[in-house]
């Protein structure tokens, strides 16, 4: 199962970390992939580790774990942000985050 | 025992296209990501493309992305590297290689196949 | 792109000494790194992955440490097999990069 915050909120020119908690005792994540709206952030595979989208690369950091920290934070970032995990052999797992951003 | 075999190497103009294959054996394929490397002429190594067990991510280095496809056929044992558009600067010793699993570090190359562009 | 500095370039040892090869990255990049050995005319062989995780087979006079930005490769007692081209590379970031090599040379 996915847990997550499903809201979060955070100020303009600030940053906040996307997180998506996956547990299970059997499936092993193989790949995470993380979305604003349909937009994609970036991609982690255990395989060929992280993949910033080129349109995030200045304000997206891996981590902490399989998150993501968010930078320099403005209006237009507030929305659904999306994770996907992908696991074997426990199929696909998705959560969802709504964050708000506030003007400082 | 574990063993990867390139080949396709050649040499083509400018311009031109060439495909790359890399056989796999002693080791289970479809189970492993599988990586390009090369390394030009008296230079070092320069890692060029990489696709996952079933291909659903791939990585491309900067000086290839939009002239090289890499693929791989898991019933084959297989893997490709579609080189379009090639430059002078192409010009390698292709490597195919196998990761450990899970960890990243390269621990079985092939003996390479070399490609030279040049008119 | 993560860049991956070596240095030196290249180093001039004899048999017993104690060499050290570092390589930084232009961004962190936790602990996924490893160390090649490059032979004339063979194909690299991996000695480290991880960092600091010895592969199979490779001697005990090998060994790495490091994390984020800075990681080193250390050579205890250079033995005669040792003189060749050792490369860093990173595995955090796609595009993986390796770093420029460092020639350790005999004296």
């Known amino acids: 199962t996915i847990d997550t915050k499903r809201n979060i909120s955070a100020e303009e020119g600030g940053s906040v970390i996307l997180q998506c908690h996956f547990s299970s005792d059997t499936a092993e994540v193989t790949q995470v992939d993380w979305k604003q709206q349909d937009q994609l952030l970036a991609i982690y595979s255990v395989d060929l580790g992280w993949h910033v989208a080129s349109v995030f690369s200045d304000r997206v950091v891996p981590g902490p774990s399989l998150g993501l920290t968010f930078q320099s934070l403005t209006m237009n970032d507030t929305g659904e942000y999306f994770c996907t995990y992908h696991t074997y052999p426990g199929g696909i797992y998705k959560g969802r985050i709504f964050l708000k951003v506030q003007e400082s | 025992q574990v063993q990867l075999v390139e080949s396709g190497g050649g040499l083509v103009q400018p311009g031109r296209s060439l495909r790359l294959s890399c056989a796999a054996s002693g080791f289970t394929f479809r189970d492993y990501a599988m990586h390009w490397v090369r390394q030009a002429p008296g230079k070092g190594l320069e890692w060029v493309s990489g696709i996952t067990w079933n291909s659903g991510l791939i990585g491309y280095a900067d000086s290839v992305k939009g002239r090289f496809t890499i693929s791989r056929d898991n019933a084959k044992n297989s893997l490709y590297l579609q080189m379009n558009s090639l430059r002078a600067e192409d010009t390698a010793l292709y490597y195919c290689?196998?990761?450990?699993?899970?960890?990243?570090?390269?621990?079985?190359w092939g003996q390479g196949t070399m490609v030279t562009v040049s008119s | 792109d993560i860049q991956l500095t070596q240095s030196p370039s290249s180093v001039s040892a004899s048999v017993g000494d104690r060499v050290t090869i570092t390589c930084r990255a232009s961004?962190?990049?936790?602990?996924?790194l490893a160390w090649y050995q490059q032979k004339p005319g063979k194909a690299p062989k991996l000695l480290i992955y991880g960092a600091s995780s010895l592969q199979s087979g490779v001697p005990s006079r090998f060994s790495g440490s490091g994390s984020g930005t800075d990681f080193t490769l250390t050579i205890s007692s250079l033995q005669p097999e040792d003189f060749a081209t050792y490369y860093c590379?990173?595995?955090?970031?796609?595009?993986?990069?390796f770093g420029g090599g460092t020639k350790v040379e005999i004296k």
């Open positions: 290689a196998k990761p450990v699993p899970r960890l990243r570090g390269l621990d079985v």
């Open positions: 590379q990173q595995a955090f970031y796609l595009p993986w990069t």
């Open positions: 961004q962190g990049i936790s602990s996924w």
